[in-house]
Interface confidence: low
Amino acid sequence: KIDACKRGDVTVKPSHVILLGSTVNITCSLKPRQGCFHYSRRNKLILYKFDRRINFHHGHSLNSQVTGLPLGTTLFVCKLACINSDEIQICGAEIFVGVAPEQPQNLSCIQKGEQGTVACTWERGRDTHLYTEYTLQLSGPKNLTWQKQCKDIYCDYLDFGINLTPESPESNFTAKVTAVNSLGSSSSLPSTFTFLDIVRPLPPWDIRIKFQKASVSRCTLYWRDEGLVLLNRLRYRPSNSRLWNMVNVTKAKGRHDLLDLKPFTEYEFQISSKLHLYKGSWSDWSESLRAQTPEEEPTGMLDVWYMKRHIDYSRQQISLFWKNLSVSEARGKILHYQVTLQELTGGKAMTQNITGHTSWTTVIPRTGNWAVAVSAANSKGSSLPTRINIMNLCEAGLLAPRQVSANSEGMDNILVTWQPPRKDPSAVQEYVVEWRELHPGGDTQVPLNWLRSRPYNVSALISENIKSYICYEIRVYALSGDQGGCSSILGNSKHKAPLSGPHINAITEEKGSILISWNSIPVQEQMGCLLHYRIYWKERDSNSQPQLCEIPYRVSQNSHPINSLQPRVTYVLWMTALTAAGESSHGNEREFCLQGKAN
């Protein structure tokens, strides 16, 4: 920073403010009796540009011509150097280098709303590096003029604070902006416009929607607008969509009927306004209105499947399952499902409403011909019922699909393939692929999954509710009229060796052989579909290799006889389980000594 210049002066010619590329003359002169004390002719005046020496001279004054100064501020300081003393600061000056303002470009003016004020924006062009004042001038009919000045170095916006009125909407107004700094001035090209050109209406407000007789087909959107609005554009979309539907309307007077809304769908609505067909600009979009359309009765039909289970000689259990309708089919909140069970020969029927579930189980006699019908109901009505005749789905052996296989297909997918049945393959009307987690107890509460496949398909990719390291019982049904045939297989999407072996819970002796019983491995430790069990045994305290017996895995089996043990020899026994990926660790060890007579 610069001191008070008591010892001398620094003068700058032609000015402290110069055009980029100009030359300045800087003169440093000592005031009388301010030189070196004894030897005034030894005065050494030094000129610094910031902290760097650029010139020096012996005497009472120093003159320096400086060129090539950069944009911005440069500080020059003059110092006096005397023999045997520090340099003394004499005086200094700051020189400001800039450019004249460029012509402001793209001047445009807007009035927001009929009651708003006129504001203009422009592009300043390159920075002048000097304080630059902008003056905006607006001239109108009857020699009216308004002027506003901007007091900001980065000024590119000014609001006149005046309101143009629509009394004479075709009257011309002209705006011009002038930039001035100490190096020059420049004016924009004039911008001429009318009231209709620059008034941008306020966005519509108070948007409402009405559904006459609670019907989606009789829907009217209402809103409020400024008085002079001629055009509106409406846009609307389901809340979960990114694409807008767009409608342009003329002279809507704050209402418009919408004819293509979907039932039971939350929509977002917005409206924009304009004063003239081809003059002016659209308003901003209004705030969104979100509204849900009314329900309509469901369309489509439920996908229904069933399972039959034998109970005893006179009764059977029927479990019905169905899939939810899609949102576009449900067209509302499904309140209940209506299940009708009918004995076709006797005409007996029972109807039940099911809420909160997509399955239903009942017990019926094994005699008679039974059919079910299932429909979905919302507040407006019911879907068409899906009707199914209850039959023995696996009764027709000749309809059984052949060579069924199940192979892992990427993450959590299983590809099921089959060959058509031997019986005339053209008789097949559809295939159903069904899968459920394999539970050793044959648990009927395990969720059932299914998909339908066209009669010419011989494969299906199942991915719904498939988890890694879980074994699934997969069935392929071929359906033809009132007959069905089926084949089954076990499959998994991903497998590894089981985490544990079976737990031997009992060893019993029967006529010179033993029967080993075990507990199933918990499902979460099987790690896929089991292929075999192995039973190992060896004499206690023996170092010999154990003998083993490999048993193919069957869901229901949990015991097996061994008849090659010697009497009165103590054996150690254990079991393992195998998947296609490998063998488990040992289960528990049990000792046993056969009591029977030696040969």
């Epitope: 920073k1 610069i2 001191d3 008070a4 210049c5 620094v10 700058v12 402290h16 403010v17 501020t73 005086c91 200094g92 000056a93 700051e94 400001f96 000097l130 304080y131 630059t132 004042e133 007091k151 900001d152 170095i153 980065y154 001035v180 700094n181 100490s182």
Partner: nanobody, 125 residues
Amino acid sequence: EVQLVESRGGLVQPGGSLRLSCAVSGFTSDYYVIAWFRQTPGHEREGVSSIRKGDGATYYADSVKGRFSISRDNAKNMVYLQMNSLKPEDTAVYTCAARYDTLLGGGRPREFPYWGQGTQVTVSS
């Protein structure tokens, strides 16, 4: 060395008056502008008023027009801000700032290289 030193502010009742002064030293030419800025917590500095040393031309922000008056005493190198009809919303830290220039303007704070230390003005009953 350019230096700016403000007088102390104070506590004033709504409707009351207060005069702030700014002692200016160190400029080497008359090409300079002195401006008063104010700032409240959480807000940007706002240009209140400014005056040019050479010809005494003045500028006022819309929020203080008709209530505040800026003046200079060239002999004493002082600039004064007379604040009348004070309102609670005038409560702020007031600081004088300076820059070399040829045209007057409220300007943005970043245009001013030289600043005083600031003084608190509180308008409250």
